[in-house]
Interface confidence: low
């Protein structure tokens, strides 16, 4: 799986999981949240060549497409797979609420 | 829906659904399908602005990010949504056979 | 109907930067890879570069680090800058469509098609 | 430096004869048939007639026709017609070069 296992040990040009923290404030300009001030979101990056971790079929057939036609901008591309939510803490007026946001956080990826 | 009804119609420069016929034999180097020749795959392609047609929580904060840290390469991509599958006609010696290959069409588009 | 028109000025004085641009219609930029390719009085044609459908710009070798492509797509508009120009880089300068193939966008086929008009460029003081 | 080279540099038949017009790439093509034949004609710009070394641009005679593979490559034009003579260029596309593109120096084909 290209997962933090993997992906951050490993130096990986082709798709794979990168380390992104971010600063909800200085990042994303959202004030609100109270607490965490920032998480480690990830993302996915990398190229994607013929067989790397194809999602489906047709991310196969484009890989193999890209190979014979290489400078054809249909190709596919390395994007989230497994996500997972963040547990916030922010106020409403003086009122203290914890919610969960889903898919917040990238855990592996995949060819698209 | 970024789909054929709206891409093909409209000059877009973010995310869409691309035409893209393929020929089996030409641009796969498959010969071992009979029918059909090649097939109407699309891809998806073009930019990922900040709530263009986001899939998840994560790709909405990624392409906020990318707003404020624009030379950063933590930016959504454009992938496929829906997929549609082919039937296929090829020969094992000289019995024909029919197979849906799943996944094979691209029918609307995402940024992830 | 497909049509690519090249225009700029036809004089340009050596050492300086020559620019011109292809204005399209009948298809979209983001759909189409363009091409420049040049031809000197009475000689060959010689590829200068492209600018793909997704954006990528690629250029022959002898023009790397001299030339830039660029496109508007809003605008219909190709541009070509060629920097440093000396009386070696007169000619007549085409811009050129990559033809499309049974939907497929055919890159490397070279298959340039349709063509421009050319726009003589003339480098002297 | 990828190298196109044409042969005869000129031909001079009469109407109705054949021409036989060659094309020699120092790497091989892409795909080993990506590779164009195009006419020109004094005060105009070139014209496709055929690409991926056989197929017949739409709206040419068939009287051109294309052949060869990976280096070598022929244009034939079967019968000459009065309007056939002018200057032909072959161009190839490469992969894995900064020069994805190279035309030959031309073969100027001339009434007898």
């Known amino acids: 799986a290209l997962d933090a296992a993997y992906c951050f040990r490993n130096v990986q040009d082709n798709c794979c999981l990168r380390p992104l923290y971010i600063d909800f404030k200085r990042d994303l300009g959202w004030k609100w949240i109270h607490e965490p001030k920032g998480y480690n979101a990830n993302f996915c990056a990398g190229a994607c060549p013929y067989l790397w971790s194809s999602d489906t079929q047709h991310s196969r057939v484009l890989s193999l497409y890209n190979t014979i036609n290489p400078e054809a901008s249909a190709s596919p591309c390395c994007v989230s797979q497994d996500l997972e939510p963040l547990t916030i803490l922010y106020y409403i007026g003086k009122t203290p609420k914890i919610e969960q946001l889903s898919n917040m956080i990238v855990k592996s990826c995949k060819c698209s | 829906a970024l789909d054929a009804a709206y891409c093909f119609r409209n000059v877009q420069d973010n995310c869409c659904l691309r035409p893209l016929y393929i020929d089996f034999k030409r641009d796969l180097g498959w010969k071992w399908i009979h029918e059909p020749k090649g097939y109407n795959a699309n891809f998806c392609a073009g930019a990922c602005p900040y709530l263009w047609s986001s899939d998840t929580q994560h790709s909405r904060v990624l392409s906020l990010y990318n707003t404020i840290n624009p030379e950063a390469s933590a930016s959504p991509c454009c992938v496929s949504q829906d997929l549609e599958p082919l039937t296929i006609l090829y020969y094992i010696g000289k019995t024909p056979k029919i197979e849906q290959l799943s996944n094979m069409i691209v029918k609307s588009c995402k940024c992830s | 109907e497909v049509q690519l028109q090249e225009s700029g000025p036809g004089l340009v004085k050596p050492s300086e930067t020559l620019s011109l641009t292809c204005t399209v219609t009948?298809?979209?930029?983001?759909?189409?890879?363009v091409n420049w390719i040049r031809q000197p009085a009475g000689k060959g044609l010689e590829w200068i570069g492209y600018i793909s459908y997704g954006g990528s710009a690629y250029y022959a070798s002898w023009a790397n680090g001299r030339v830039t492509i660029s496109k508007d797509t809003s605008k219909n508009q190709v541009s070509l800058k060629l920097s440093s120009v000396t009386a070696a880089d007169t000619a007549v300068y085409y811009c050129?469509?990559?033809?499309?193939?049974?939907?497929?966008?055919?890159?490397?086929?070279?298959?340039?098609?349709?063509w421009g008009q050319g726009t003589l460029v003339t480098v002297s003081s | 430096e990828i190298v196109l080279t044409q042969s005869p540099g000129t031909l001079s038949l009469s109407p109705g004869e054949r021409a036989t017009l060659s094309c020699q790439s120092s790497q091989s093509v892409y795909n080993n048939n990506y590779l164009s034949w195009f006419q020109q004609k004094p005060g105009q710009a070139p014209r496709l007639l055929i690409y991926?070394?056989?197929t017949l641009t739409s709206g040419i005679p068939d009287r051109f026709s294309g052949s060869g593979s990976g280096t070598d490559f022929t244009l034939t034009i079967s019968r000459l017609e009065p309007e056939d003579f002018a200057v032909y260029y072959c161009a190839g596309g490469y992969s894995g070069s900064s020069d994805k593109y190279a035309f030959g120096g031309g073969t100027k084909v001339e009434i007898k």
């Open positions: 050129a469509r990559h033809m499309q193939v049974g939907g497929a966008p055919t890159g490397s086929m070279a298959a340039f098609d349709p």
């Open positions: 991926g070394a056989s």
């Open positions: 009948g298809f979209s930029l983001s759909s189409y890879t």
